[in-house]
């Protein structure tokens, strides 16, 4: 397997982005759901995949200078997949009062489809994607962003809503996935892992990164998200993988900084406004896409998932800072909020470059690729 | 259409505890925050806190000590419990649909609220 | 918390007149996060703007809401009879979410 390398010669104060190395694509798992090493079993036995909840979306961002290094999804190393059952999504809450369990949480019940039946559904998100599967689309081109790069004042809410920490975007933040497919911010936020257990909801090749920021949008086409719930394309969603560096994130230091505010599930506090486009990796040009569902209920699909294949760079403190600072409902931690992956059902993963193209020898078969579909229709 | 429909006892001792449910029906109680607001008679409304459908809570301030909100998804239902009541607690109490994680809009669906009395 | 102020507290005037109404927020109003409700007697409350400008869904175009940051005017351009009743300003940008005491507008 191939290791990631560690971000070199970074920019003073730390670049947002990792490495451009491509992700090996030896070892692929043979199942979408199927446990993997860096996730051991939580503390309980989970029901399966619609049970475990996932989340939303964090703040977008535009592109930033090419300076920094950067890993890139198709570069990183493959776990080969252990044989036992379905990767929990266990978040080892445990409510107080002996609570009847009868919310919705990562992990135990009750199931997701009960919730909400689109949970059910077969077209969900999170995923497992596989770069040599995805189909190329020259048609999919650099994503645009406009208004990403905030004013100290007004200020931002910061809001630890219990199942994520979550950064409310002003109006203003204009992103377009195309000609004609414009898209406002609403809001980002994180999903992450615990000590030594990585977090993100997606993951290549089986490989789960720390973490995993989300930028939700909604079309313009919509005036509010529940008009654009369940529609094709009626929300995007940007994520973006975080990965260990040796260097301080500045960008991310400026959230990370306030969560010991808004520890107490339900706390909100006011930050200064920020770059936003400096939470994201710097290559708009090279990603993934497909369509899927909301993570958490009501698992509404039709949601436009832009998943980019360069990383985001963050410390180990800060990782830690955020695994480790926020509680959730009943006296339980903040961890391990996201969902296990969903099975694709026939969908193809597009890609926005040639993720397929492995330029390093290997004695495995060829791979047959998908042929993009309606990229940019 | 969604609609809400508030219910429990219309008389509590003081002392003792308020317990009121609100059932959601013509759509799912997913996503959504869910509000608890009172008014006493002849007087304007008062927030008294909030829960998403995970379970988590946020509450005024100035009752925190005394509320408890629960949500049963299964149920479609969301509760409210408010210990140690007073004569001042009596008011005309209102459930309401307020907003969604990922926007926020308001309170644009109430229940027709129903009256607490406080009294020995 | 934020403090919302409503005046006037009463405001008589006739059908067809126009009708201004404002809230003030004691510190300014996270994203414009401010909504008006109508209430009348019996009945509970009724969204009509939210965003401090958008009208919620079935709102008639003559009601209007305005402003940013710590002024927020809500307008009737033409009072009908149906719209003399108590309005409520909220904001719902920061917690504890708060509500004005209410301006209360009848029949001249």
């Known amino acids: 397997q191939r290791l990631p390398r560690m971000q070199e010669d970074s920019p003073l104060g730390g670049g947002s982005s990792g490495e451009d190395d491509p992700l090996g694509e030896e070892d692929l798992p043979s199942e979408e759901d199927s446990p993997r090493e860096e996730d051991p079993p939580g503390e309980e036995d989970l029901p399966g995949e619609e049970d475990l909840p996932g989340e939303e979306d964090l703040p977008e961002v535009k592109p930033k200078s090419e300076e920094e290094g950067s890993l890139k999804l198709e570069d990183l190393p493959t776990v080969e997949a252990p044989g036992d059952p379905q990767e929990p999504q266990n978040n080892a809450h445990r409510d107080k009062e002996g609570d009847d369990q009868s919310h919705w949480r990562y992990g135990g019940d009750p199931p997701w489809p009960r919730v909400s039946p689109a949970c059910a559904g077969r077209f969900q998100s999170p995923v497992d994607i596989r770069p040599q599967l995805a189909a190329f689309c020259p048609a999919l081109r650099p994503l645009e962003l406009l208004g990403f790069q905030l004013p100290p004042l007004p200020e931002l809410r910061l809001r630890n809503n219990g199942h994520s920490v979550q950064l409310t975007l002003p109006p203003g933040l204009e992103m377009a996935l195309g000609p004609g497919r414009e898209y406002r911010a609403l809001q980002l936020h994180l999903h992450w892992g615990a000590a030594g257990r990585p977090g993100s909801e997606h993951t290549v090749e089986g490989h789960r990164f720390p973490a995993e920021i989300h930028v939700v949008h909604l079309s313009t086409a919509f005036a509010r998200v529940d008009e654009a719930l369940g529609r094709p394309g009626g929300l995007a969603v940007l994520a973006a993988f975080l990965e260990e560096g040796p260097e301080e994130n500045s960008a991310y230091e400026q959230l990370l900084s306030r969560l010991e505010e808004i520890a107490e599930e339900g706390s909100e506090t006011q930050v200064p406004g920020l770059d936003i486009s400096a939470l994201l990796p710097s290559d708009f040009s090279r990603y993934f896409q497909y369509e899927g569902s909301l993570t958490t209920p009501p698992c509404a699909q039709g949601v436009i998932w832009t998943v980019f294949n360069q990383t985001v760079m963050l410390s180990a403190k800060q990782l830690h800072t955020l695994s480790d600072t926020l509680w959730g409902p009943g006296d339980s931690r903040l961890q391990l909020n996201f969902r296990a992956t969903q099975p694709l059902n026939g969908r193809v993963i597009e890609a926005s470059f040639p993720a397929g193209v492995d330029s390093s020898p290997r004695a495995a078969e060829p791979v047959q690729l998908n042929s993009c579909l309606a990229a940019g229709d | 259409q969604v609609q809400l429909q508030e219910s429990g006892p219309g008389l509590v001792k003081p002392s003792e505890t308020l317990s009121l449910t609100c059932t959601v029906s013509?759509?799912?109680?997913?996503?959504?925050?869910w509000s608890w607001i009172r008014q006493p008679a002849g007087k304007g409304l008062e927030w008294i806190g909030r829960i998403y459908t995970s379970g988590s809570t946020n509450y005024n301030p100035s009752l925190k000590s005394r509320v408890t909100m629960s949500v049963d998804t299964s149920k479609n239902q969301f509760s409210l419990k408010l210990s140690s009541v007073t004569a001042a607690d009596t008011a005309v109490y209102y459930c309401a649909r307020d907003g969604q994680w990922l926007e926020d809009y308001g309170m644009d669906v109430w229940g027709q609220g129903t009256t607490v009395t406080v009294s020995s | 918390e934020i403090v919302l102020t409503q005046s006037p507290g009463t405001l008589s005037l006739s059908p067809g007149e126009r009708a201004t109404l404002s809230c003030w927020a004691s510190?300014?109003?996270?994203?414009?996060?401010l909504a008006w409700y109508q209430q009348k007697p019996g009945q509970a409350p009724r969204l009509l703007i939210y965003?401090?400008?958008s009208r919620a869904t079935g709102i008639p175009d003559r009601f209007s809401g305005s402003g940013s940051g710590t002024d927020f005017p809500l307008t009737i351009s033409r009072l009908e009879p149906e719209d003399f009743a108590v309005y409520y300003c909220q904001q719902y940008g920061s917690s504890p979410l708060t509500f004005g005491g209410g301006t209360k507008v009848e029949i001249k």
């Open positions: 965003g401090a400008s």
């Open positions: 013509g759509g799912s109680i997913s996503s959504y925050y």
């Open positions: 510190q300014s109003v996270f994203s414009n996060y």
